[in-house]
Every structure is written in structure tokens, then in C-alpha cells.
Interface confidence: low
């Protein structure tokens, strides 16, 4: 049987080497002579040779300074045999503890270590974690029990003790309020690492903690007061620019600027941001109206596009926008004037007056009328009052200047502000009719042929209205009735059909048609008839002398 | 010519309410804004108010909640109305006619001025 | 709101004595687009309401007599009175019209010896 106490050995020994560790022995060694040897890493493996044993009385030794963070057990096996070589005994375990000696520095694993924390947060907000290792005996000594500390603070404000580690944990905690990122955006602490829980071997390194924004400053209008003026009626038109400064992290939205116009219910006026700058960019809504007032006094607000996270006083600034007078055209009323006529209204009477209204009350200006377009030439103005005449002879069936009974004119109303404005109205003379006009026959040249000739149908046309036209009656005068006859085509009596009463020689004749509306307003009108050298419809005829009253005039 | 005369109760009681009327002449409430100033006795004189001539007013901002401002242009009067009356609001209150500029560069002085109405606040 | 400060607050002078009054005010009141200084001046005689003299900062009102003179620009404004006379006995008020609240000076009270 083997007997072999315990064996553990120091790392990091001085010597002298070889140093005794202890004494192999065998209780068969009062048998005989016993001779030991051993195998195993350390003995014949490598690291070969760190270990030796004195053949003949078994004592172990270790022949070099061991490192127990390199190897911390060695595992070899003990033999013993007779001075005839036979093993006395079976090959025995024997496990080597290397014990540790604190001869390693805790090592964070990293240089700088980056941590954030929102400014503001309150102590005990957690920000970061710093980790260091250490390669000694963490579960036999306290050579690996790592302390935390914070050496240094940089900057030392507000309190040099703004932050505070956990000893066993390396956590990195608020400790004291008053982080504030515009003032101290960040923070640089030197931690330190100690084996023996402090008292050991030390290392340091950076903790770099970033303070991030939160929205704790609002934005601030500089200047408060701003002035602008903006020309009435004209809307979408800038201002002024209002100023503002926000501490916080620019091109945030704890940064980023949100106008408000506290007394602006009429919708008149807008503020919109500049997004490079945060700049109010104040404009008109829609268009003002110097007559009805001529100054605004603003009172703009402005917050950020997230809330406040703590109670702040919220910036105003006060703008007075001063609206400048534009000479304004005159307006007609109304714009377009419709005004019922007789087409036989006398000549240089009155019609009417169109008049137009000064929008620039305070100006006080004098208006002067005049017609712009008059394409008949019927009418004139008072230049002073508006009032309406005519010069000339109206007439409805002036179809070139009247349309559907209507005449239009456009009278202009000029003012003598400065510039002069002008303003226009449309003035549309309804002309009523008067039987001005008697019926005429159409066409009023009709041929006919020599041989059975076709009868040709007249249409009589009146320009008037009813019921000054149709049914209309038509006669044949000065003997025409003679060689002519004329019957009515339609109950309305609008056309009629004229046929010759006998065959007639080739010439021209002349045919006195008299035509009378229902109104009994008749006109003589002169047919020119054609008979021409052919038989049924008339085709193209010679010229010849005409015939008076239906008889050929000899030539 | 133009005038502006005030008409008040000349005594008010402390939480009480003041109406003042301001009845002018000699121009167009349609077409000129009132101001109102107050002059408390021996003391300056403090703006109150505005009416334009379109009817929309402006208030000094410190005593914007307990004034009113209206006016009937027919009638050519203008009202000033001030709610929950103190000792310190007893002065001498005046009406006057901003000035009118033709192009108009912005900015109102008073160019005539009513002769004012005393005011006192007392129980 | 722009506070106006005129100085003195009261002075006496004799009958023909030319006499300066200044109003400061706690902000500008030229205004860049127009180069105009939204300041007038009013006279308040005892008893009676106030009259105005001067707007603009320096345009006299129709029918003041030209020994008022008013000048200055920006924030210092100064009232002078060439060669005073019995009847200019009164408290003299600036006012500023730049924006609202529209704001008076606490006034000069210039008396005659």
C-alpha cells in the first residue's frame, strides 16, 4: 500500500531548487528494497522534469518555480518497484495543488468603457457597468476579489460626486442630482479595480458617460417684440422672422421650434419653422383688409415638438403688423347690371345709372365713369355720376351688336388714388321690341321655266318678335295678279307659293308683293322673276329687260 | 369739428362694475379707431385700449380680463365696460381719436382727446 | 411692455428760457422698414386733457407752434421748447405707439418761476 500525505505547493518559490515536497512511500518497502519512479505531466510528459523523485527513498521534489494561473494541478502517477524490476505496487494517483499567490493585477476588459444617461435622472439611476478580471485564485483567496472604485471625476460639477459604483458589481449609478447636459454634456470617471477586495493589486481604467438631452430648456423668443407690415389683401405674404434659442440638442425634437398665435381667431395670420434655423416665419393666412383695421397686435407663443419634461415658462413675443393701404379699384353694384329698354327709347334720355363704390374709404377718392366698350356706339356717360344715355337710335334687330335681345356694354370706373385703380362693370340693355320692322318676302329673285313650270315658294321673314310677325298676309299689287297667283303654304301663313297663271314668254319680269305682319305693319316688296328657256325647274337664264307688273317690258 | 365727450357714473362701488360711454362727432367710427386712457389722480396716464374701425380691439394685456370695448357706429358711441372694480381703479378716464395717415406707415398717436370722465371707487 | 422714462420728473424755468426734456424708452422704437420712431409728445395742461405736440418722434401736430421742436431717435428722445412761455405751464408726456401695450413716461411738470 502506498502512503503519500497530501501535496500542494506554493507558486512563485524562491528555491533553492530542487526543494523537497514530500516523501513517497510503500509498506512493502520492509519486503525489500523498493525503488520509485513517477510518470505523468510535469514528470516524463511535459513540461518534463518539473518534478523529480529520489529513487531509493521517494522523495518527491519540484525542481522550478511553479505558476498556477500556467498549470494549477498536476496529476502524476507514482511507481515502485524490486531491485529485480518488478512492481512492487500498483501505479498510484498522485494530484500536485498548486496554491496561488497573489501575483496577478485584476484586468478590465476594456480601456474605456461608454455609457449613457439621461440628464436630469434621478440618483440611483443605473447608467453603465465596468467589468475587470482577474487570473489569480478567485474561490480559495480573495487574490482575484475585485473592489470597484471611482479615483476621479472630470469636470467636478456640479458635485464632485455626481456618480457612485457598486464595490462588488461595477455598476455605475446617479448619485447626486443636477446632471445637465447643456452645461456638462459629458463626464470622464478613472475606475479602479483591487484584488484582496480593495486592498491589492489595483488597475484602471475610463468610463466616459455621455449626458443625454431631454427636452429641459424651452425655446425663447430674443427679441420679444418684432414689427412688420404687409400690404392689404394680399395673403401667403412673409412678415417677419422671429427669433428664438433652445439650449437643447439642436435638430431635436426637444430643439425643434412649434409656433402658436394666441389671438389670431380669424385665422388671419400664420407662423410656420424654418427647419434649418428654428426661425418663426410669420405670414398672412389670408388677405387683410386695411379698411376694416389697420394694425395687429400678435402675441406668438412658442413650445417644442415634444412636451417639457419638466415645468417650464413658456416664451412669448409680441408682434404688431401694421397693414399698408393699396389702392383698391373701384366696385360696380353690382357688378353686372341688367336693365329692360324699349328698342325705341328717345335719343339722349337717361337709361340708368351704374355707379361704382370706393373700397379706400379713407381716401376719400373721387370716381370718374366712363364706357369701355360700346360697339354699336349707342350710348354715353356721366363721367361725374354714372348716369347713362343714349346717343344714338337703339335697335334690337341690330343683330350684329345684339344678341337674344341683348346689348352688353362694360362701363369702367377709374379712381385717382396713385396708382389709379380702374374697376369694370357690365351693363346689359334687355331691348324690348317694337314693330320697327315690316315683313319681306325671301328670296326675293326667283326663276321659273318657260315649260311646265314648277311654283317656287317664298318664306316671309320678319325681324321683329311676336306678335309683331307671323300669321302674315300676303297680296299681289300693281296688276301682278294678272299673270300670277299666290297661295299660303303653311297655317302660320310664313310662307307663301307664287305660280305663274299662263305660259310665258322667256324674260324678265318685275312682281309687286305686298306683305303685312299680324300687327298690320306691311311693306311693298319687288319680286325680280326670271323665265328662262326650260322646262320644269328653273335652271340658268339669259339676262333680259324686266317686265313691270308681271308683263315683260319689251326691250 | 371733431369732438368726443365721456359720460360715466362718477362713483362706483369696490367689485362693481364701470361703463363709460364716449359719444363722438365730427368723424366716422366706421372709419377712425378710439383709444381709451386712464389718469389716476396726480399720477401718469395708462393705455387701456383699442377699437378699429372695423370693430376689432386690442387691450393692454394687464387688465385684458376685465375689460370690454365695443361701440354702435350708428349711434357714434363707444363703450368701455370694467369688471370688478378696485380702489386703485379711480382715475380720470379719457376716450380719443387715433390719428389716420393716407398709405398709412403703421403706428397710432391720439390727435384728439375727450375731456374726460372722473371716476372714483368707494364704499 | 416697453417701459418710458423721462427725466426730469419736474423743472422750472423763466418766461423766454429755451428748456430740454428727455424720455428714454427700454427698447427701440425705430422701425427699420419705414426709419420711423413710433414716439409722440403730449402736452396736459392743469385741468385739462392731453394735447398732442409731436409724432413721428419729430413731425409737429397742425396748429403747434413751431418752438416745439421734438428730436431723437431709436431709445433717447428729447422735447425742446425754444423759448418758453406762460402758457406752456404743463406736464409734458412721451408715449410710444411701437406696440402694444402703447406706453407713456411718467411726464416732466415744467413750471414757470
Known amino acids: 500500500d502506498w502512503v503519500i500525505p497530501p501535496i500542494s505547493c506554493p507558486e512563485n518559490e524562491k528555491g533553492p531548487f530542487p526543494k523537497n515536497l514530500v516523501q513517497i512511500k510503500s509498506n512493502k518497502d520492509k519486503e525489500g528494497k523498493v525503488f520509485y519512479s513517477i510518470t505523468g505531466q510535469g514528470a516524463d510528459t511535459p513540461p518534463v522534469g518539473v518534478f523529480i523523485i529520489e529513487r531509493e527513498t521517494g522523495w518527491l521534489k519540484v525542481t522550478e518555480p511553479l505558476d498556477r494561473e500556467r498549470i494549477a494541478t498536476y496529476t502524476l502517477f507514482s511507481h515502485a518497484v524490486s531491485s529485480n524490476g518488478n512492481a512492487v505496487e500498483d501505479p498510484m494517483e498522485i494530484l500536485i495543488t498548486v496554491t496561488d499567490q497573489n501575483d496577478n493585477k485584476p484586468e478590465f476588459t476594456q480601456e474605456v468603457f461608454k455609457g449613457s444617461v439621461m440628464e436630469g435622472a434621478l440618483p440611483g439611476t443605473s447608467v453603465m457597468e465596468v467589468t475587470a478580471t482577474d487570473a489569480d485564485d478567485d474561490v480559495n483567496t480573495y487574490n482575484a476579489a475585485i473592489a470597484y472604485t471611482i479615483l476621479s471625476q472630470d469636470p467636478e460639477l456640479p458635485d464632485k460626486n455626481m456618480f457612485t459604483i457598486n464595490r462588488n458589481t461595477g455598476v455605475i449609478s446617479v448619485v447626486t442630482t443636477g446632471l445637465d447636459r447643456e452645461s456638462f454634456p459629458t463626464y470622464t470617471l478613472v475606475v479602479q479595480a483591487a484584488d484582496l477586495q480593495g486592498e491589492g493589486l489595483s488597475t484602471t481604467a475610463t468610463a466616459v458617460i455621455t449626458v443625454t438631452d431631454t427636452n429641459d430648456n424651452p425655446p425663447i423668443f430674443n427679441p420679444t417684440t418684432y414689427k412688420g407690415q404687409v400690404p392689404e389683401n394680399e395673403a401667403n405674404v412673409v412678415i417677419t422672422t422671429l427669433k428664438v434659442t433652445d439650449a437643447d440638442a439642436p435638430n431635436t425634437p426637444a430643439w425643434e421650434a412649434v409656433y402658436t398665435i394666441l389671438n389670431d381667431d380669424g385665422g388671419q395670420f400664420v407662423v410656420t419653422t424654418n427647419p434649418v434655423n428654428n426661425d418663426g416665419i410669420l405670414k398672412t393666412a389670408k388677405g387683410l383688409d386695411f379698411e376694416a383695421k389697420q394694425q395687429y397686435i400678435l402675441h406668438v407663443a412658442v413650445t417644442n415638438v415634444v412636451p417639457f419634461e419638466v415645468s417650464l415658462t413658456t416664451s412669448t413675443a409680441t408682434v404688431t403688423v401694421d397693414v399698408l393701404d393699396v389702392n383698391e379699384a373701384p366696385i360696380f353694384v353690382p357688378p353686372e347690371k341688367r336693365v329692360e329698354v324699349s328698342e325705341d327709347f328717345g335719343v339722349g334720355q337717361e337709361i340708368t345709372s351704374y355707379t361704382a363704390q370706393e373700397p379706400d374709404t379713407f381716401m376719400e377718392q373721387k370716381i370718374t365713369y366712363r364706357i369701355w366698350r360700346d360697339t354699336a356706339n349707342w350710348l354715353e356717360i356721366n363721367p361725374d355720376t354714372g348716369a347713362i344715355s343714349t346717343r344714338a337710335e337703339l335697335d334690337r334687330e341690330d343683330f350684329e351688336h345684339v344678341k337674344n335681345s341683348t346689348y352688353t356694354a362694360l362701363i369702367i370706373a377709374t379712381d385717382n388714388g396713385s396708382p389709379v385703380a380702374t374697376g369694370t362693370g357690365t351693363l346689359l340693355l334687355i331691348l324690348s321690341d317694337v314693330n320697327d320692322n315690316a315683313p319681306i318676302p325671301e328670296p326675293r329673285t326667283i326663276f321659273f321655266c318657260e315649260r311646265n313650270p314648277k311654283p317656287q315658294v317664298i318664306n316671309i321673314i320678319d325681324a321683329d318678335l311676336p306678335p309683331n310677325t307671323s300669321p302674315f298676309t300676303a297680296e299681289l299689287t300693281h296688276g301682278a295678279s294678272a299673270n300670277w297667283t299666290i297661295q299660303y303654304n303653311d297655317p302660320t301663313q310664313e310662307s307663301i307659293i307664287l305660280k305663274p297663271k299662263m305660259a310665258l314668254e322667256v324674260g324678265d319680269y318685275k312682281i309687286n308683293l305686298k306683305l303685312m305682319d299680324n300687327q298690320n305693319k306691311d311693306q311693298v316688296t319687288t319680286l325680280e322673276v326670271s323665265v328662262c328657256d326650260c322646262e320644269g325647274a328653273a335652271g340658268v337664264c339669259r339676262k333680259a329687260q324686266p317686265v313691270e307688273a308681271g308683263l315683260q317690258i319689251p326691250a | 369739428q371733431v369732438q368726443l365727450k365721456e359720460s360715466g357714473p362718477g362713483l362706483v362701488a369696490p367689485s362693481q362694475s364701470l361703463s363709460i360711454t364716449c359719444t363722438v362727432s365730427g368723424f366716422s367710427l366706421s372709419r377712425y379707431s378710439v383709444q381709451w386712457v386712464r389718469q389716476p389722480p396726480g399720477k401718469g396716464l395708462e393705455w387701456l385700449g383699442m377699437?378699429?374701425?372695423?370693430?376689432?380691439?386690442d387691450y393692454n394685456s394687464g387688465l385684458k380680463s376685465r375689460l370690454t370695448i365695443s361701440k354702435d357706429n350708428s349711434k357714434s358711441q363707444v363703450f368701455l365696460k370694467m369688471n370688478s372694480l378696485q380702489t386703485d381703479d379711480t382715475a380720470m378716464y379719457f376716450c380719443?381719436?387715433?390719428?389716420?395717415?393716407?398709405?398709412?406707415?403703421?403706428?397710432?398717436?391720439?390727435?384728439?382727446w375727450g375731456q374726460g370722465t372722473s371716476v372714483t371707487v368707494s364704499s | 411692455d416697453i417701459v418710458m422714462s423721462q427725466s426730469p420728473s419736474s423743472l422750472a424755468v423763466s418766461v423766454g428760457e429755451k428748456v430740454t426734456m428727455s424720455c428714454k424708452s427700454s427698447?427701440?422704437?425705430?422701425?427699420?422698414?419705414?426709419?420711423?420712431?413710433?414716439l409722440a409728445w403730449y402736452q396736459q395742461k392743469p385741468g385739462q386733457s392731453p394735447k398732442l405736440l409731436i409724432y413721428w418722434a419729430s413731425t409737429r401736430e397742425s396748429g403747434v407752434p413751431d418752438r416745439f421742436t421734438g428730436s431723437g431717435s431709436g431709445t433717447d428722445f428729447t422735447l425742446t421748447i425754444s423759448s418758453v412761455k406762460a402758457e406752456d405751464l404743463a406736464v409734458y408726456y412721451c408715449h410710444q405707439y411701437y406696440t402694444s401695450p402703447y406706453t407713456f413716461g411718467g411726464g416732466t411738470n415744467l413750471e414757470i418761476k
Open positions: 427698447q427701440s422704437l425705430l422701425y427699420s422698414n419705414n426709419q420711423k420712431n413710433y
Open positions: 377699437i378699429w374701425g372695423g370693430g376689432s380691439t
Open positions: 380719443a381719436r387715433t390719428q389716420f395717415y393716407y398709405g398709412h406707415d403703421g403706428g397710432y398717436a391720439m390727435d384728439f
